[in-house]
């Protein structure tokens, strides 16, 4: 069996987790990708997913999560902004490939968010000059509901990873026309 490895990120509240998930370019370029949290004793829960088919470098926002899929590079960028202590947990990127089970990408991300701000920005706490609001646009892309014995994913419940409400806006540098996915309560 493949040993599941973890990469640990220790950040403060308010900071940004900004990670990459590499995938095999030829196989998965336009496949739908998802960001999941794995709670102890629970099946993985999908917090955000790209469109289907996934669009090249178009950001998709679900609450405080932004996904960008770079097809030409075989890389998914995942950002979780304005981190909260409750966001702590184990995360993974997966690729949807129906009717087969989602393909998991290594490594998993062990996120530890602690209270208080150190004053030193973390993984990607940008001190930006030009900051643009993400317009609240929506998309038809929804995350599939998988119910296999080993992997269950679903639209994010209100309590999962403190995903913000559909009305919230995130400050990012130079982001407009972003695809915004509604959060399901």
């Amino acid at each position: 069996a493949t040993k599941l490895t973890e990469e640990k990120y220790e950040l403060k509240e308010g900071q940004t987790l900004d990670v990459k998930c590499d995938y095999t370019l030829e196989k998965f370029a336009s496949s739908q990708k998802a960001w999941q949290i794995i709670r102890d004793g629970e099946m993985p829960k999908t917090l955000a997913c790209t469109e289907r088919p996934s669009k090249n470098s178009h950001p998709v926002q679900v609450g405080r999560i932004i996904l960008e899929d770079y097809h030409d590079h075989g890389l998914l960028r995942v950002r979780m902004v304005n981190l909260q202590v409750e966001d702590s947990g184990l995360y993974q990127c997966v690729i949807y490939q129906p009717p087969k089970e989602p393909h998991m990408l290594f490594d998993r991300i062990r996120l530890v968010v602690t209270k208080g701000f150190s004053g030193t920005p973390g993984s990607n706490e940008n001190s930006t000059q030009n900051v643009y609001k993400i317009p609240p646009t929506t998309t038809k892309a929804l995350c599939p509901l998988y119910t296999s014995p080993r992997t269950v994913t679903q639209a994010p419940p209100k309590s999962t990873a403190d995903v913000s409400t559909p009305d919230s806006e995130i400050n990012l540098t130079n982001v407009t026309d972003i695809i915004r996915v509604p959060v399901f309560n």
Epitope: D18, K20, S57, P59, E68, G122, N124, N126, N174, V175
Partner: antibody, heavy 123, light 107 residues
Framework: QVQLVQSGAEVKKPGASVKVSCKAS????????ISWVRQAPGQGLEWMGW????????NYAQKLQGRVTMTTDTSTSTAYMELRSLRSDDTAVYYC????????????????WGQGTTVTVSS | DIQMTQSPSSVSASVGDRVTITCRAS??????LAWYQQKPGKAPKLLIY???NLQSGVPSRFSGSGSGTDFTLTISSLQPEDFATYYC?????????FGGGTKVEIK
């Protein structure tokens, strides 16, 4: 093939303005951003700013704010960088460079570069 | 702004040598680091993106590693065409910033 071709060398007097062009070919211009980077003689690389060829969003280096303007013309797949109130320390080779990312800079670096435009500022 | 510190500033090496260049960020940048090669009178060339991903067309003797604040570019077996100046660049926070460069010279 994918390339960026820049306009020719310029000699300017202090206080003048310069506008450098960067014509893209071989790829979908609006699917990428364009960064501008300069290099003074014998020095390292300095990022000047970035423009989205998709929607025209810009982000400029703070030290150049107010003096630099970056624009694109999607009909000709050309990016432009104008620098005003030139000083002698603006003497440098100016490069345009393509970066993946239409919205938020170039997180994967700059994969295609123009040949460079030498701008000399001298009285 | 995030400061990028490269070391050494120059290195003398021979063809076939293994060369390692390090880059340190003043704060965490996750994996968002690029490495470039520049030869005199030429534009920089992207070698590595996202810390460890080899740019298309770049020889496999180049490799990158690291995350957070500490990164490494390794040339496993130096070739004559590799004598150049190498720059790292953080590519996540605005403004993007470059290291001061490392010149790889012939011993």
């Amino acid at each position: 093939q994918v390339q960026l071709v820049q306009s020719g060398a310029e000699v300017k007097k202090p206080g003048a303005s310069v506008k450098v062009s960067c014509k893209a070919s071989g790829y979908t211009f609006t699917s990428y951003g364009i960064s501008w980077v300069r290099q003074a003689p014998g020095q390292g690389l300095e990022w000047m700013g970035w423009i989205s060829a998709y929607n025209g969003n810009t982000n400029y280096a703070q030290k150049l704010q107010g003096r630099v303007t970056m624009t694109t013309d999607t009909s000709t797949s050309t990016a432009y960088m104008e620098l005003r109130s030139l000083r002698s320390d603006d003497t440098a080779v100016y490069y345009c460079a393509r970066g993946a990312g239409m919205y938020d800079g170039s997180p994967l670096g700059m994969d295609v570069w123009g040949q460079g435009t030498t701008v000399t500022v001298s009285s | 702004d995030i400061q990028m510190t490269q070391s050494p500033s120059s290195v003398s090496a021979s063809v076939g040598d293994r060369v390692t260049i390090t880059c340190r960020a003043s704060q965490g940048i996750s994996s968002w680091l690029a490495w470039y090669q520049q030869k005199p009178g030429k534009a920089p060339k992207l070698l590595i993106y996202a810390a460890s991903n080899l740019q298309s067309g770049v020889p496999s003797r180049f490799s990158g590693s690291g995350s957070g604040t500490d990164f490494t570019l390794t040339i496993s077996s130096l070739q004559p065409e590799d004598f150049a100046t190498y720059y790292c660049q953080q590519a996540t926070a605005h403004p993007p910033t470059f290291g001061g460069g490392t010149k790889v010279e012939i011993k």
